[in-house]
């Protein structure tokens, strides 16, 4: 999917409102220093294909992340401000719920949860700093 | 963890070719632009060249434009710098580096390779 | 093209706060990092975007950049601070990486 045409701005305040809420729910008693940045992303369409590449494809070691509430509330913000998104999104639901895996946080999520903060914080920064 | 390591250095005369490879591992390469930087003996860093994430763009340092060529291969996590018509300032230990950018501006280098060397000599 | 001017060498006693700068036109305006290299070894990033430390780096290690200077702040410098330091910048105009000069810090 191409994110560019996607609402931005309102991707952005319910990112602020609910999903960042419940990504630092996830993430609670452990600190984002904890992980490397092993992931980036370098504008707005790039941080959402990499957002939605972690949140929703399931990974050897962190399988279960899409049934989580930030993951729910991920893919209902971009079926609502991003173009066609849902449309594309029904083939990849239905082979999802075939894969039922016991809820298990484990170190890996942990890490994988770390780097979608990352990715959401560059993508909420409209610029660097500077320049 | 996360790594760079740098291979494909050694002596060679001027005017000859020598293409250097690094080996990414431990992050997700495509995501991240890519420089070389080199260091001549004795002296202080200079920065060669960059590629974009995603391959869309590069850049040289005048001293090298029309003589080396940075490519990246996202699907084996490499890096490359072919070097043609080498000179004796060349000579110098090539480091790879890593750096996330935002739009067309890149952000600071947070890992590096080991470095490997490249003799220019007769 | 653009310049970053260092000083060559700093020194600063066991203890004590070590400052080296890094002197550009309007620097203020450019985001700012600096890396640490030992004999031998590969540059280690040490700040970045002016004042940001990565996790791995002590506190000890800050930054500060306004007008036409950026420093580079070591305090309570010790033996293992022994390095050369490099700023470093991206150029937008030139679309290149711009390194100072390089600035070799002793602890006496």
């Known amino acids: 999917y191409d994110f560019t045409n996607c609402d931005f701005q309102k991707i952005e305040a319910d990112y602020l409102r609910t999903i960042s809420k419940d990504l630092i729910t996830y993430m609670s008693g452990t600190k984002s220093t904890d992980f490397n940045n092993t992931v980036s992303c370098s504008n707005r369409p790039h941080c959402l294909t990499e957002i939605q590449s972690l949140t929703f494809n399931p990974t050897p070691r962190c399988a279960s992340l899409a049934k989580e509430m930030f993951a729910r509330k991920t893919k209902a913000t971009l079926a609502l401000w991003c173009p066609g998104y849902s449309e594309t999104q029904i083939n990849a639901t239905q082979a999802m719920k075939k894969r039922r895996k016991r809820k298990v946080t484990t170190n890996k999520c942990l890490e994988q949860v770390s780097q979608l903060l990352g990715l959401w914080r560059r993508f909420i920064r409209t610029l660097l700093k500077k320049q | 963890q996360m790594q760079l390591v740098e291979s494909g250095g050694g002596v060679v005369q001027p005017g000859r070719s020598l293409r250097l490879s690094c080996a990414a591992s431990?992050?997700?390469?495509?995501?991240?632009?890519m420089h070389w930087v080199r260091q001549a003996p004795g002296k202080g860093l200079e920065w060669v060249a960059v590629v974009w994430y995603d391959g869309s763009d590069i850049h040289y340092a005048d001293s090298v434009k029309g003589r080396f060529t940075i490519t990246r291969d996202n699907s084996k996590n490499t890096l490359n710098l072919q070097m043609n018509s080498l000179r004796a300032e060349d000579t110098a230990v090539y480091y790879c580096?890593?750096?996330?950018?935002?739009?067309?501006?890149?952000?600071?280098?947070?890992?590096w390779g080991q470095g490997t060397m490249v003799t220019v000599s007769s | 093209s653009y310049v970053l001017t260092q000083p060559p060498s700093v020194s600063v006693a066991p203890g004590q706060t070590a400052r080296i700068t890094c002197g550009g036109n309007?620097?203020?305006?450019?985001?700012v990092h600096w890396y640490q290299q030992k004999p031998g070894q590969a540059p280690v990033l040490v700040v970045y975007d002016d004042s940001d430390r990565p996790s791995w780096i002590p506190e000890r290690f800050s930054g500060s950049n306004s007008g036409n200077t950026a420093t580079l702040t070591i305090s309570r410098g010790e033996a293992g601070d022994e390095a050369d330091y490099y700023c470093q910048i991206w150029d937008s105009s030139s679309d290149h990486v711009v390194f100072g000069g390089g600035t070799k810090l002793t602890v006496l």
């Open positions: 309007n620097i203020g305006s450019k985001s």
């Open positions: 580096s890593r750096s996330p950018q935002w739009e067309d501006i890149f952000e600071s280098m947070d890992i």
């Open positions: 431990g992050f997700t390469f495509r995501t991240y632009g």
